[in-house]
Amino acid sequence: ESALITQQDLAPQQRAAPQQKRSSPSEGLCPPGHHISEDGRDCISCKYGQDYSTHWNDLLFCLRCTRCDSGEVELSPCTTTRNTVCQCEEGTFREEDSPEMCRKCRTGCPRGMVKVGDCTPWSDIECVHKESGTKHSGEVPAVEETVTSSPGTPASPCSLSG
């Protein structure tokens, strides 16, 4: 008969164990990195690099790890307790309303506008009309020019589409 496992009892190395048994199925939850067995009596480890679970759960199956698309870089790999973190490659971005693919950032602003925000992995360059002023320094280029963007560095988790 297995001993009752509480959340406090689970050291990191135990969470990575292939199988965890619970003596109290009425509690009904398995720790991150595991899913529940069909009969609700056991906690079964997710497969490293293949699937994961992030919270205490009663899931029948672990969630599939995201695979970064072409045009993305993998910032951190999938573990049994955390999904892959993907980021758009330098010079591209992913919008919230179209998360399925990275799009190329514009290389500059249209005539009569100035750049006030750089290309980042989650946003295109930001342009404003000269007349309306700028959001940052307030400087306006003296001559008409196309301002090229520089890539940002912060990371963002990738979309769930694999």
Epitope: G28, H35, I36, G40, Q50, D51, S53, N57, D58, L59, L60, F61, C62, L63, R64, T66, L160, S161, G162
Partner: nanobody, 124 residues
């Protein structure tokens, strides 16, 4: 976004067999766990069977164990429910569902998508 369309339902005599299919559109089909649910007239929707994204793990409700088999073909974006030794109490509309996973009680986890259902009638 995943669209699901069930087919294969019909009228069958008790003891007979049917194979339901659920065709999915969308390139992310293989990311999802798939489940079959059923709703008999005047009853609540019931969790019947499910399998994980790879097809390597399956779940069946006790009442269908040994009679029903769930499987998937990720290359064809299709999930199947092979139903043998059918009983009149299996009569219901059968629904296909896709989700990140399913809880032990059949609750979908994450975004979930549902088909419109296919009717299975088992006569005695």
């Amino acid at each position: 976004e995943v669209q699901l369309v069930e087919s294969g339902g019909g009228l069958v005599q008790a003891g007979g067999s049917l194979r339901l299919s659920c065709a999915a559109s969308g390139r992310t089909f293989s990311n999802y766990a798939m489940g079959w649910f059923r709703q008999a007239p005047g009853k609540e929707r019931e969790f019947v069977a499910a399998l994980n994204w790879s097809g390597g793990s399956t779940y069946y409700v006790d009442s269908v164990k040994g009679r029903f088999t769930i499987s998937r073909d990720n290359a064809k974006n299709t999930v199947y429910l092979q139903m043998n030794s059918l009983k009149p109490e299996d009569t219901a509309v059968y629904y296909c569902a896709a989700a990140g996973s399913f809880s032990l009680g059949g609750r979908p986890y994450g975004d979930d998508y549902w088909g419109k259902g296919t009717l299975v009638t088992v006569s005695s």
